[in-house]
C-alpha cells in the first residue's frame, strides 16, 4: 500500500488492560441518560491490521450473514462485497436474504487510485457487539472493484459513518448511522478508540488481538484518561474541524492558519496517515528534520516510502519531536491542543527485515485535499463523534503507545483570536466533480 492510501494504519495490542472496564466518576457536565457510563458489550469490538483498517463485525440479511466491516469516518456509504473476489473469504449473498429489497439503482465510486461499483438495496443490519437493535439500512452491494479490497485485511465491506452530503450516488441515500438513530433509541453519537500496537503484528496475532472499540450511542469512561475537549464540527459532510495552530516540539510553524485547513481538515478513521496540505507538510517535515538532526534519514523516508530500521528495542524515540495540533474550542477565542508522539507518526512495518530489527515508515504525508487526521492522530486519542451537538471530542486514549518520558496529551484552554478566519471556504462546484479518494 502506498503512503497516501485511505485505509487506517494498524490495530492490535494496546497499552490498556483488557476485559471489564468500570466507569469512573467524572466532574464533567451531566448529559441525557444512556449517553455515558460503561458499554461493556461494545468495548474491544474492533480488530485490524497494520495499514489495512479497523473493522467491526456486522450481520446483514435474514438469516443473518456475518461480515467484517471497515469503520470509516471519511465516507458515508455502507458498502459490502457481494460477489466473489480473490481477496474476500466471504461476501454478502443477497439471494439468500428474505429481507433484501432491491432499489433498482446502481452506484459507482471512483477513488484517486481504484474504485468500486455496485447495486443499491436495503436489508436488515445489526452489530453483534453493538447496541441490541436491528435496522433496515441502505446497502451498496459491491459487484466490481479495483484496488479496493486488500489481500489479508480480513474485512469484506466498509461502514461510512460521515454525513449524507457525501453519500453516493447523492445525498438522498441515507447513511447507516442516520438510519440507526431514526429507527431506534440509540443517541446520535458514537466514539472510537483505535489502539495501535506499537509493533507489527502477523495475521494470527491480529485475529487474536484487540484493535480498539467503537461505542455506538455513548462514551465509555474506561477508554480514556483526563478530560474530553470538544471542537465544533464546522460543516456536516466529512467530520470537518478547524486547526488554528501547529507546533513541532513546542515550536510554532507560524503559518497563516488558513493553510492548515486548505481546503478542509477532517477526522478520518479510513486514512492511515496524518496528511497535511503541501505547504504545511513541507514546513512540518523541515521542522521535524531539524528536531531530529542528530541522525539523518534517506529522502525516501520522509516521503513515506523507504523504511528505517533499528536494532530491536533501540528505536531512538527521544530524537523525534512531538507534534501538537491546536483545535478550535467550543468557547469563543478558546482553543485546545492535541499532542502526538513519534510512536504514533512512525508506523511499525512487518516482514521487511530480520527479527532483530524494528522498522518504521514515516506516517505523515502530503495532501492536495486538506488535512486528514487519520489513524496516526486517532490512535493517540479517544475520539467522540457527538453528532447531536455537532462537535468532536478528544481525550487521551487509555491504549495509546508511549514511553516512560512522554505521553500523548489533550490540553487547554488556550486563548486564540480570530479562529473563524482559519476556515477555508471551498468554492461551490458541481458535486459530480468531487473525487472520493483522498490519496
Amino acid at each position: 500500500t502506498q503512503h497516501g492510501i485511505r485505509l487506517p494504519l494498524r490495530s492490535g495490542l494496546g497499552g490498556a488492560p483488557l476485559g471489564l472496564r468500570l466507569p469512573r466518576e467524572t466532574d464533567e457536565e451531566p448529559e441525557e441518560p444512556g449517553r455515558r457510563g460503561s458499554f461493556v458489550e461494545m468495548v474491544d469490538n474492533l480488530r485490524g491490521k497494520s495499514g489495512q483498517g479497523y473493522y467491526v463485525e456486522m450481520t446483514v440479511g435474514s438469516p443473518p450473514q456475518t461480515l467484517n466491516i471497515l469503520v470509516d469516518t471519511g465516507s458515508s456509504n455502507f458498502a459490502v462485497g457481494a460477489a466473489p473476489h480473490p481477496f474476500l473469504h466471504r461476501y454478502y449473498q443477497r439471494q439468500l436474504s428474505s429481507t433484501y429489497r432491491d432499489l433498482r439503482k446502481g452506484v459507482y465510486v471512483p477513488y484517486t487510485q481504484g474504485k468500486w461499483e455496485g447495486e443499491l438495496g436495503t436489508d436488515l443490519v445489526s452489530i453483534p457487539h453493538g447496541p441490541n437493535v436491528t435496522v433496515r439500512a441502505n446497502i451498496a452491494a459491491i459487484t466490481e472493484s479495483d484496488k479496493f479490497f486488500i489481500n489479508g485485511s480480513n474485512w469484506e465491506g466498509i461502514l461510512g459513518l460521515a454525513y449524507a452530503e457525501i453519500a453516493r450516488p447523492d445525498d438522498s441515500l441515507e447513511p447507516f448511522f442516520d438510519s440507526l438513530v431514526k429507527q431506534t433509541h440509540v443517541p446520535n453519537l458514537f466514539s472510537l478508540q483505535l489502539c495501535g500496537a506499537g509493533f507489527p503484528l502477523n495475521q494470527s496475532e491480529v485475529l487474536a488481538s484487540v484493535g480498539g472499540s467503537m461505542i455506538i450511542g455513548g462514551i465509555d469512561h474506561s477508554l480514556y484518561t483526563g478530560s474530553l475537549w470538544y471542537t465544533p464540527i464546522r460543516r456536516e459532510w466529512y467530520y470537518e474541524v478547524i486547526i488554528v495552530r501547529v507546533e513541532i516540539n513546542g515550536q510554532d510553524l507560524k503559518m497563516d492558519c488558513k493553510e492548515y485547513n486548505y481546503d478542509k481538515s477532517i477526522v478520518d478513521s479510513g486514512t492511515t496517515n496524518l496528511r497535511l496540505p503541501k505547504k504545511v507538510f513541507e514546513a512540518a517535515v523541515k521542522s521535524i528534520k531539524a528536531a531530529s538532526s542528530t541522525e539523518k534519514f534517506p529522502d525516501g523516508f520522509w516521503l513515506g516510502e523507504q523504511l528505517v530500521c533499528w536494532q530491536a528495542g533501540t528505536t531512538p524515540w527521544n530524537i523525534f519531536p512531538v507534534i501538537s495540533l491546536y483545535l478550535m474550542g467550543e468557547v469563543t477565542n478558546q482553543s485546545f491542543r492535541i499532542t502526538i508522539l513519534p510512536q504514533q507518526y512512525l508506523r511499525p512495518v512487518e516482514d521487511v527485515a530480520t527479527s532483530q530489527d524494528d522498522c518504521y515508515k514515516f506516517a505523515i504525508s502530503q495532501s492536495s485535499t486538506g488535512t486528514v487526521m487519520g489513524a496516526v492522530i486517532m490512535e493517540g486519542f479517544y475520539v467522540v463523534f457527538d453528532r447531536a451537538r455537532k462537535r468532536i471530542g478528544f481525550a487521551v486514549s487509555a491504549c495509546h503507545v508511549h514511553d516512560e518520558f512522554r505521553t500523548a496529551a489533550v490540553e487547554g484552554p488556550f486563548v486564540t483570536l480570530d479562529m473563524e478566519d482559519c476556515g477555508y471556504n471551498i468554492p461551490q462546484t458541481d458535486e459530480s466533480t468531487l473525487m472520493t479518494g483522498r490519496a
Partner: antibody
Framework: QLQLQESGPGLVKPSETLSLTCTVS??????????WGWIRQPPGKGLEWIGQ???????FYNPSLKSRVTISVDTSKNQFSLKLSSVTAADTAVYYC????????????WGRGTLVTVSS | EIVLTQSPATLSLSPGERATLSCRAS??????LAWFQQKPGQAPRLLIY???NRATGIPARFSGSGSGTDFTLTISSLEPEDFAVYYC??????????FGGGTKVEIK
Amino acid sequence: QLQLQESGPGLVKPSETLSLTCTVSGGSISSSSYYWGWIRQPPGKGLEWIGQIYYSGSTFYNPSLKSRVTISVDTSKNQFSLKLSSVTAADTAVYYCARLGHGYSYFDLWGRGTLVTVSS
Amino acid sequence: EIVLTQSPATLSLSPGERATLSCRASQSVSSYLAWFQQKPGQAPRLLIYDASNRATGIPARFSGSGSGTDFTLTISSLEPEDFAVYYCQQVYVWPPRTFGGGTKVEIK
C-alpha cells in the same frame, strides 16, 4: 575530486581486533549530504554491508555483526574508522569504505579496498 | 528479511550482443534498487540508482527498469570493458544492507 582510501594491517590474528581507517580527500567528511560506510567481500564471494556513520557520530550497524563492530569518525582528520573485534578466519575479506549519497541511500563512491587476512 | 536473487549466475555473451540481467526481490522494494559493476581486483561502481537512473558518467548503453519485485539491468551492446560481475542492492529497507548474489557476464 573526492577520493576514499582504506588503510590498516593486512594480517590480523584470530581473536584480535581488526582496525581500519578510511581517509577522505578532496572533500569534507562533515558534509551534511552523506553517510560514510564499510562493506566487505570475502574472496570469491558477494558484498556484505558492515555499517555506516554520519559526521555527527550517528551510527547504524549490520545486526549480524553489531556486537563486534564499532565505527567512529574524526572530522578533524577527515577520517572514519572500523574496528571489528574477536575476528576469525570467516572475517577474511576485502574491506571497502564508501560514501552513501543520493539522499543517503546509495553507495556512489568507493575506496579501492584493502585485503585483510585473519590467520595465526 | 528481503532477499535479492540474481539470475542467471553467469551470462556468456559476445561483444556487441545485448545483455539482460535480472534481480528479483522476495517482497516489494518499490523503486529503491541499485545496480553495481565490479571488475576483477576493483571496487564496485554504481551504475544505476532508483531502479532506472544512470549514475554520473555511466554510458547510455546501461539501462535499468522495473519496480516492486522484478528488476532488469540491460546492456544494449556489450563493450569489451563491460565483462564483469554485476550486483543489485535494495535500499527500500534502510540502512541499505541487502545485496544480490551477483551475475557474472563473461566473454563467450
